[in-house]
């Protein structure tokens, strides 16, 4: 139960009052306001929007609203020297060039400063060579090419379709395979849902539409020039050669009209199986190079983008807590967009704006939350989560001592089918209880709870009658809070039906066609899904900031730890000979998980029984809950990834968007049969089991009685 005790307020100021104040019409109005011009990170337009949000949050009633600026490495196309790709003949003449921009959507023809499609942080270069089609450029795709098909990508330009994994992983894989350039394209198989028209007549990607995006492999570092520290006025910056995560080969994105022209001429090997074929009318031959008649033609990339240190601005709003002002619950989402940001990020920013307005309304009526709530409008998320990471680096000592929870608020929708939640296990019960109290916006579920429609449409694979909640990966601003600092984190949005729509993300992601009209006409005309997401995100923040006992259930961590231990053991047992030879034991890990389970159970019993009127004991129990997530942090970080420090979860080494459990053990086991020194490789597996077992045991002990 939420509580209002000690905050000197009337009973009407509870969760219901906060939720009732949230209005779909306001979210709609805010979305329109935020999407009329581009708000690219580092531009004057985005600075002006930061100041507007600062001003409005002050008007809404927050105690203080400040801009926090940093000077970080960003990347832009050269305005006078555009990026493009050519097919050249044997004389070097360009016989085909890809488009220089996306045809603007209706009503936006005269908008200036639309950045053309580019891969942010691509180095400059004009490589030319034969093309190799590498499917999604996943680790397993390169294994198929190199090991099974014996195709060498060294010195080749590779063309990969977007989807399945983060684009930065694709580029890293191509680099490791020896490619000298990467072309990324959107295949209709992944970005054109059957039976839906392309924009502006529907929500599908037109042939001239292109996905922008950064291609960094930062592994949580933030600004590439100041890893670990804020990019402030007195920062020491690395030289560009020492910068973290920059790609070493030119990369450029194109749409499927242009991709058709490149892929239709491909020769060489046939695709290995149907999973390598998209939906274009091309053979999807792997190459290398073009077929017979065109075998003398090559592909040439022309990339002239520049990396520039540029000022960015976060907006940080504070609503001081009445009882525990030194405990922070953070709601943050980014403000910068690639172009108009109709979905990403402004569908999220508009929801944050309405949540701030609702909290402000309650505050003006005399209410305060028990704990401090911080609201953040992050900059430069699209360039590598830079704004959130720099702010967290600057404030890390405060955050690690005072951070209760972080709720992320990027895009509110990626579909309109059902809820999608990724969070720490500590928040499972909070999410379950909250969604049981909220009304479902779904057709056919009138009068039913959100929990009911969500569970029906997205059931848990393990527990019947419960909804699916996923692991946190990365690719968004919770990363530094969860993966580096160990602050309990969660995110929620409305999503598509993954069963029937197997395309990646939403079709117009990071294109010029991500407009206000896309949302208003096709995704959420009544803004009812936005309102539901506002209720979920806002409701989580309200409970985290206002409940007397933190709404964390440590027993749910015990359950998942057992599941993850079972899974990693099973992976390891696929190598029984080596397990026996090198005496690889999971006994310590299973024993630690058993201890955690028992101690968590006892802690939960004490949590029911203790005297909540004793502020010292209350604070002590709450601190044990708050610091549990922190206990899973290894100060040394994961191998070669020092800013990924959570031992239970990390972004997958093969897909930044996905979460991996026991990532240290998982990575040590990955492709272990190909390692040149098996003894050393299995030694590392044993070391990672030791680290995991120790961490789980240490975390368990933080829940034991203190004396």
């Amino acid at each position: 139960k939420s509580s209002n005790e000690a905050t000197n307020i009337t009973p009407k100021h509870n969760m219901k009052a906060f939720l009732d104040e949230l209005k779909a019409e306001n979210i709609k109005k805010f979305l329109y306001n935020f999407t009329q011009i581009p708000h690219l990170a580092g531009t004057e337009q985005n600075f002006q929007l930061a100041k507007q949000i600062q001003s409005q949050w002050k008007e809404f009633g927050l105690d203080s609203v400040e801009l926090a600026h940093y000077d970080v490495l960003l990347s832009y196309p050269n305005k006078t020297h555009p990026n493009y790709i050519s097919i050249i003949n044997e004389d070097g003449n360009e016989i085909f060039n890809t488009s220089l921009f996306e045809p603007p959507p209706p009503g936006y023809e005269n908008v200036s400063d639309i950045v053309p499609p580019f891969s942010a942080f691509s180095p400059q270069g004009m490589p030319e060579g034969d093309l190799v089609y590498v499917n999604y450029a996943r680790t397993e795709d390169f294994f198929k090419l190199e090991r099974d098909m014996k195709i060498n990508c060294s010195g080749k330009i590779v063309i990969a379709r977007y989807g399945k994994v983060f684009r930065g992983n694709k580029v890293k894989n191509a680099q490791l395979a020896g490619a000298k350039g990467v072309i990324l394209y959107s295949d209709p198989a992944d970005y054109f849902a059957p039976g839906v028209k392309s924009y502006p007549d529907g929500w599908n990607l037109p042939g001239g539409g292109v996905q922008r995006g950064n291609i960094l492999n930062l592994n949580g570092a933030g600004d590439p020039l100041t890893p670990g520290y804020p990019a402030n006025e007195y920062a020491y910056r690395r030289g560009i050669a020492e910068a973290v995560g920059l790609p070493s080969i030119p990369v450029h994105p194109i749409g499927y009209y242009d991709a058709q022209k490149l892929l239709e001429k491909m020769g060489g090997s046939a695709p290995p199986d149907s999973s390598w074929r998209g939906s274009l009318k091309v053979p999807y031959n792997v190459g290398p190079g073009f077929t017979g008649n065109f075998s003398t033609q090559k592909v040439k990339m022309h990339i002239h983008s520049t990396n520039e240190v540029t000022r960015i601005y976060n907006v940080i709003g504070t609503l001081r807590g009445a009882v525990e002002p030194d405990r922070y619950v953070i709601l943050g989402g980014h403000r910068d967009s690639w172009v108009f940001g109709g979905i990403d990020p402004q569908s999220g920013a508009a929801v944050v704006h309405e949540i701030v307005r609702s909290f402000g309304t309650l505050k003006k009526e005399g209410w305060r939350p028990r704990r401090t709530i911080l609201f953040a409008s992050w900059d430069a998320e699209e360039f590598g989560l830079l704004g959130s990471t720099e702010w967290a680096e600057e404030n890390s000592r405060l955050l690690q001592e005072r951070g209760v929870a972080y709720i992320n608020a990027d895009s509110s929708i990626e579909g309109n089918y059902t809820l999608r939640v990724d969070c720490t296990p500590l928040m499972y019960s909070l999410v379950h209880n909250l969604t049981k109290e909220l009304k479902s916006p779904d057709e056919g579920f009138e009068g039913k709870s959100l929990y009911e429609s969500w569970t029906k449409k997205s059931p848990s694979p393990e527990f019947s009658g419960m909804p699916r909640i996923s692991k946190l990966g990365s690719g968004n601003d919770f990363e530094v809070f969860f993966q580096r600092l160990g602050i309990a984190s969660g995110r929620a949005r409305y999503t598509k039906n993954w069963e029937t729509n197997k395309f990646s993300g939403y079709p117009l992601y990071h294109s010029v066609y991500e407009t206000y009209e896309l949302v208003e006409k096709f995704y959420d005309p009544m803004f009812k899904y936005h309102l539901t997401v506002a209720q979920v995100r806002g409701g989580m923040v309200f409970e985290l900031a206002n409940s007397i006992v933190l709404p964390f259930d440590c027993r749910d961590y015990a359950v998942v730890l057992r599941k993850y231990a079972d899974k990693i053991y099973s992976i390891s047992m696929k190598h029984p000979q080596e397990m026996k030879t090198y005496s690889v034991s999971f006994d310590s890990l299973f024993s630690a998980v058993k201890n955690f389970t028992e101690i968590a159970s006892k802690f939960s019993e004490r949590l029911q029984d203790f005297d909540k009127s004793n502020p010292i004991v209350l604070r002590m129990m709450n601190d044990q809950l708050m610091f549990l997530e922190r206990a899973f942090i290894d100060p040394l970080g994961l191998p070669d990834r020092p800013f990924y420090r959570h031992v239970i979860y990390a972004p997958s080494s093969h897909n930044k968007y996905a979460g991996e459990s026991f990532p240290g053990i998982y990575d040590a086991l990955f492709d272990i049969e190909s390692k040149v020194d098996p003894s050393k490789a299995w030694g590392e597996v044993k070391r990672q089991i030791y680290v995991a077992a120790f961490t789980v045991q240490a975390a368990a002990e933080t829940l034991s009685e203190v004396a």
């Epitope: 057992r562 029984p576 026996k580 006994d587 299973f590």
Partner: nanobody
Framework: EVQLLESGGGLVQPGGSLRLSCAAS????????LSWVRQAPGKGLEWVSS????????DYAATVKGRFTISRDNSKNTLYLQMNSLRVEDTAVYYC??????WGQGTLVTVSS
């Protein structure tokens, strides 16, 4: 002391079935994931299947998927392997494994006409 005792092996014709059991003692049975591993005559060890805390979390080698079913009864401290549609190439000594280092002595399964 950890003890794993397999039983249920024997001679069976191709297409036949067998159910292997592994009685466990000396440890908190329900707290551990368990596996079956086999070794065909003159060959190396081959993982067959693993099971987690309950009968929902199971994993199988491609060679046995759809034919073999792993299960456990935590109240009896026993692990099982139901083997159907047996083939000649399933002939092997089958071992029950806890945590990677504790192995049973094995039970021989011979599939022959």
């Amino acid at each position: 002391e950890v003890q794993l005792l397999e039983s249920g092996g024997g001679l069976v014709q191709p297409g036949g079935s067998l159910r292997l059991s592994c009685a466990a003692s000396g440890f908190s049975f329900s707290s551990y994931a368990l596996s079956w591993v086999r070794q065909a005559p003159g060959k190396g060890l081959e993982w067959v299947s693993s099971i987690g805390e309950n009968n929902h979390t199971t994993d199988y080698a491609a060679t046995v998927k759809g034919r073999f079913t792993i299960s456990r009864d935590n109240s009896k401290n026993t692990l099982y392997l139901q083997m159907n549609s047996l083939r000649v190439e399933d002939t092997a000594v089958y071992y029950c494994v806890k945590d990677g280092v504790h192995w049973g002595q094995g039970t021989l399964v011979t599939v022959s006409s």
